[in-house]
Interface confidence: low
């Protein structure tokens, strides 16, 4: 019995269906086929869980969280024992193993390993201003999404015809911050933060209005 090499890893957007491949060749009839799919969750590597089991011509549910979401992609018994996971959740990220036995066929590699990463687009980010908006002050524009896998990067733009930040601005696309030093009237305007990762983009807007000192009345 020989389990084929798998592609190594599968990436899927949260909520979509993941297909985890596993196929094998055997010299014996599929009368005593036994297939166990296990997962080592990324969130808890010490706690492997059963995903689905095929034994004695019957399918059995694995861990409760997979109930109703997991099945074999084809009619069993078969030499393609790939599974699907519907409505993928972040907690489904992990290393999946298919263990195949088909007596009396012994020997060879009977385990296939596939990594699953569930990707999450950035949630709508929060835009905030830190610091005084008085003329000549330094301000920090903050942007962050609660969700996003891979971790989002953040791009700040000033929504004028140039889409350029003021010359006194420095941007950190990893932290999602823009520091604008010595703000002037030209710093005023609408700023947009775009949070993006491999599978999604979301935005928030922020209105920066520089406050000029009131002329003193004599």
């Amino acid at each position: 019995l020989e389990v084929s090499e798998s592609p190594g890893s599968v990436q899927v957007a949260r909520g979509q269906t993941a297909v985890l491949p596993c196929a094998f060749s055997t010299s014996a009839a599929l009368l005593n086929l036994n297939v166990i799919w296990m997962v080592i969750p990324l969130s808890n590597a010490n706690q492997p869980e059963q995903v689905i089991l095929y034994q004695g011509g019957q399918m059995f549910d694995g861990a409760l969280r997979f109930h109703g979401r997991v099945g074999f992609t084809g009619t069993m018994p078969a030499t393609n024992v790939s599974i699907f996971i519907n409505n993928t959740q972040l907690s489904d990220t992990g290393t999946y193993q298919c263990l195949v036995n088909n007596l009396p066929d012994r020997g060879g590699r009977n385990i296939g390993v596939t990594g699953l990463t569930v990707l999450v687009p950035p949630s709508a980010p929060q835009c905030q201003i830190q610091g005084s908006q008085d003329l000549g002050s330094d301000v920090i524009l903050l942007c962050s999404s609660e969700e996003g896998i891979p971790r989002p990067t953040y791009l700040w733009e000033k929504l004028d015809n140039t889409l350029k930040l003021p010359p006194t601005a420095t941007q950190d696309q990893v932290q999602g911050t823009v520091t604008i030093r010595n703000i002037s009237a030209l710093s005023s305007g609408l700023y947009q933060c775009v949070a993006s990762n491999a599978i999604g983009t979301s935005t928030c807007l922020l209105d920066l209005q520089v406050i000029s000192p009131q002329p003193r009345s004599v």
Epitope: G15, P121, P122
Partner: antibody
Amino acid sequence: QVQLVQSGAEVKKPGASVKVSCKASGYTFTGYYMHWVRQAPGQGLEWMGWINPNSGGTNYAQKFQGRVTMTRDTSISTAYMELSRLRSDDTAVYYCARDPDGSGGSSRWFDPWGQGTLVTVSS
Amino acid sequence: QPVLTQSPSASASLGASVKLTCTLSSGHTNYAIAWRQQQPGKAPRYLMLLNSDGSHTRGGGIPDRFSGSSSGAERYLTISSLQSEDEADYYCMIWHNNAWVFGGGTKLAVL
């Protein structure tokens, strides 16, 4: 299963307002943004805006700003879209549509949609 | 604001294949789109998410007769082995700056 059920057809006079409801079931109402899209007879789809049922925050398409109000009642898992100062060209089918992941982003396509509510504006 | 351009109509024979096009305006050619189908008198249903690299994810229950591909600013929806129920309007759509943008739609006639 997830379902969005909208209120029935309405006939309104120009200048009046209409309020369409969308009752959600089969999922956590506050976990997913709700969008409204309309379609005039024989025309394409037009996005009107969204409401975050959790916070009540809204984002309206510029075209409808000042005329549309989106609200929700979390106790009965229902979203509402009110359009005021109706004109004859507001005659359309109005759809509510759930955002699968609860906020904006290019992979978050509407699914599912309500069955649509026909609003006819006629004097 | 990005613009999505679709041909107003297309036609093909029963059992044949047809390729519908959605063109993204310049500056937005790396956007993913969604294809939707709207059968007469029904709400639009999700067909697939189509990325700029041509990779696509079909919605639940969508047969593999529906496939997507991309080239530059063009996003394609190919329907093979056309069936009478494929006669419908097809829309492409994107998310941009917290808003949805729809193409004008293509009315597909199955002859």
